[in-house]
């Protein structure tokens, strides 16, 4: 049932031992009680005891006190269980009877006689407090108390709310006095069936099946599932969402395994040569005179740099060289002349000028010739005049630079502007960058080419690059990009310090 009407009989007084019909009991009134509980009636009528009925064994003779008894026959208080919502009103009929027969089951005895009866009608709320009453008539007095309480697992004002504490797959809770659920520690939800994950466990990227646990969804890792897992094979890169690989400063390639600062990290160039982060292997060594090889590791012949001047011939020695000078010259490199202008020492149409009162001379060479005697033809490419990887080519008296794609100018010094083709729509401003053109858009437009018209949320079009977080500003058309490490600019479009000439870098 959902509740119990409890009636505690306390004292019955029938001093004269009289029955209701005026006769006296011989030798005394052996008294038992019949109780009938039914729905509220303004005028109590015979008929079924709709809320229940109960009888007692013989409790005493004439006048007696009824003791509390918790089990067996003669239990007191009397229990009238019900299995419905307690309506809050009732009618109660308590009858005292005399039996000449069996003490324990007087109901079944013939010849029972009514001593007295009382009828109570009224309202009664569910609660633990006993309501005490006393009823008198001319011959008898009955003292009693009564209450309505809810059965185990039933709660509320009418014992209509069922709540049974549990700690299993279907819920983890205890019951409050009003029947509402009180979740056990670590559980939440309407039925306390949702675990409370480890504090800080990412709401979207983590979950749990029991309290204080944090299980990561695919693509996430870490104690709180707030670290993305980069693309498999990503070497020197990070991610802002799973399976990305965004290269760290100084690294390139799809898997960030190409060293853009190879020169700094590995020092591959030997013998004082210069290293630049360019070329098919990511670096190029420019050798000092006297060295060759990919890493300038090979020493050339000491004569390879042509140290002997004025037509002197060079001879290699163990750690040095020796110049054999032609007639009229002397010195370590045949740099000193014993000739004068009278000896016509200037070749290729060079003009001779006397010096030191005619004891020596100097040649003024025509275009395309050099050397102290104008004996060498000028190689106009020796000074490496072509910038940005351009190839130098000798063309008769002049030289030309053959530029790599994206460069122009006499010395390939000019970057061909990607902005020349006006890629920015709606009046956007174009900026030439190492990675290509970037547009700064006017208010109301966004996108890499300012092609997206902003209607509501300025962040909706994803104006921030390189994994940056977008925040809308003071008005709908404003936004602010919060750049990840390694990027700057109003849209985080500029990589910080990107080396310009490595093959992986456009």
């Amino acid at each position: 049932g959902s509740g119990i009407f409890q009636l505690r009989l306390q004292e019955f007084v029938n001093q004269r031992g009289m029955l209701a019909n005026g006769q006296s009991c011989e030798p005394g009134c052996r008294t038992f009680f019949r109780i009938c509980l039914k729905h509220f009636q303004a005028t109590f009528s015979e008929g079924p005891c709709t809320f229940g009925n109960v009888s007692t064994p013989v409790l005493g003779t004439n006048s007696f006190v009824v003791r509390d008894k918790n089990s067996g026959s003669g239990r007191n208080p009397l229990q009238l269980p019900f299995n419905f919502t307690w309506p809050g009103t009732f009618s109660l009929n308590i009858q005292a009877w005399h039996t000449p027969g069996d003490d324990l089951r007087p109901e079944t005895s013939p010849g029972n006689s009514l001593i007295s009866q009382i009828i109570i009608q009224g309202s009664l709320a569910v609660g633990k407090i006993w309501r005490t009453d006393e009823q008198n008539d001319t011959l008898t007095r009955l003292s009693y108390s009564y209450r309505v309480i809810c059965s185990d697992n039933y709660y509320g004002e009418s014992c209509s709310r069922l709540c049974k504490k549990r700690d299993d797959h279907f819920g983890h809770y205890e019951c409050q006095p009003d029947g509402s659920l009180s979740c056990l520690p670590g559980w939440t939800g309407k039925y306390c069936d949702q675990p409370i994950c480890l504090s800080g466990c990412h709401e979207q990227n983590g979950y749990c099946s029991k309290p204080d646990e944090c299980i990561c969804r695919p693509g996430w890792q870490g104690r709180l599932c707030n670290e993305c897992i980069p693309h498999n094979g990503c070497r020197h890169g990070t991610c802002s969402i799973p399976w990305q690989c965004a290269c760290d400063e100084g690294w390139g390639g799809l898997f960030c395994d190409q060293d853009l600062n190879y020169c700094t990290h590995h020092s591959p160039c030997k013998n004082g040569s210069t290293c630049s982060n360019s070329g098919p292997k990511g670096y190029t060594c420019t050798c000092l005179p006297g060295y060759t090889g990919e890493h300038c590791e090979l020493g050339l012949s000491k004569c390879a740099s042509n140290p002997c001047r004025n037509g002197g011939s060079c001879k290699d020695q163990e750690n040095s060289y020796h110049c054999l000078c032609p007639p009229g010259y002397y010195g370590q490199h045949c740099e000193h002349s014993t000739l004068t202008c009278a000896d016509s020492p200037c070749f290729n149409g060079g003009s001779c000028r006397e010096r030191n009162q005619g004891s020596s001379y100097a040649c003024e060479c025509p275009p395309n010739f050099t050397g102290s005697n104008c004996e060498k033809k000028v190689d106009r490419c020796t000074s490496n005049p072509c910038a940005n990887g351009g190839q130098c080519q000798n063309r008769g008296p002049s030289r030309t630079c053959r530029c790599r794609p994206g460069f122009t100018g006499t010395h390939c010094e000019l970057h061909i502007s990607d902005c020349a083709r006006s890629p920015c729509a709606h009046g956007g401003t174009c900026h030439d960058l190492e990675n290509g053109p970037v547009c700064t858009c006017p208010a109301g437009f966004s996108g890499r080419r300012c092609e997206v018209r902003i209607t509501h949320d300025a962040c909706a079009s994803g104006p921030c690059f390189n994994g940056a977080t977008c925040y809308t500003g003071l008005s709908p058309n404003n936004f602010v990009c919060n750049c990840p490490y390694g990027f700057v600019g109003s849209r985080c479009e500029f990589p910080v310090g990107l080396p310009p000439s490595f093959p992986w870098v456009a």
Epitope: C234, C245, G252, F255, A506
Partner: nanobody, 120 residues
């Protein structure tokens, strides 16, 4: 939504050729570098080639240099990988990828892949 769809894979004999295509959509194609990487069963992925947004700078892994050629057709929003002199060790799933920037520096978006099997 950025999409990269690979096609052109299949079964080929050693020494044969294949041409893979990567059709791109959902972004301004000529703003982004595009590359190819491959993954054989039980092995780490290997970046094999990449072409910058302008098409002026290309990269090849040593294992494919001289045999594979990458190119792009900005008008068709497509990148191609011409694979010649194929070897059994070229067998893998080939993926198209972009770093989401003009230079070949990382992976942001990846296609579903196309299987290439080199076997006699």
């Amino acid at each position: 939504e950025v999409q990269l769809v690979e096609s052109g894979g299949g079964l080929v004999q050693p020494g044969g050729s294949l041409r893979l295509s990567c059709a791109a959509s959902g972004f301004t194609f000529d703003d982004y570098a595009i590359g190819w990487f491959r993954q054989a069963p039980g092995k780490e992925p290997e970046g094999i080639s990449c072409i910058s947004s302008s098409g002026g700078i290309t990269y090849y892994a040593d294992s494919v240099k001289g045999r594979f050629t990458i190119s792009r057709d900005n008008a068709k929003n497509t990148v191609y990988l011409q694979m010649n002199s194929l070897k059994p060790e070229d067998t893998a799933v080939y993926y198209c990828a972009t770093p989401g920037i003009a230079a070949c520096r990382g992976i942001h978006y990846t296609g579903q892949g196309t299987q290439v099997t080199v076997s006699s």
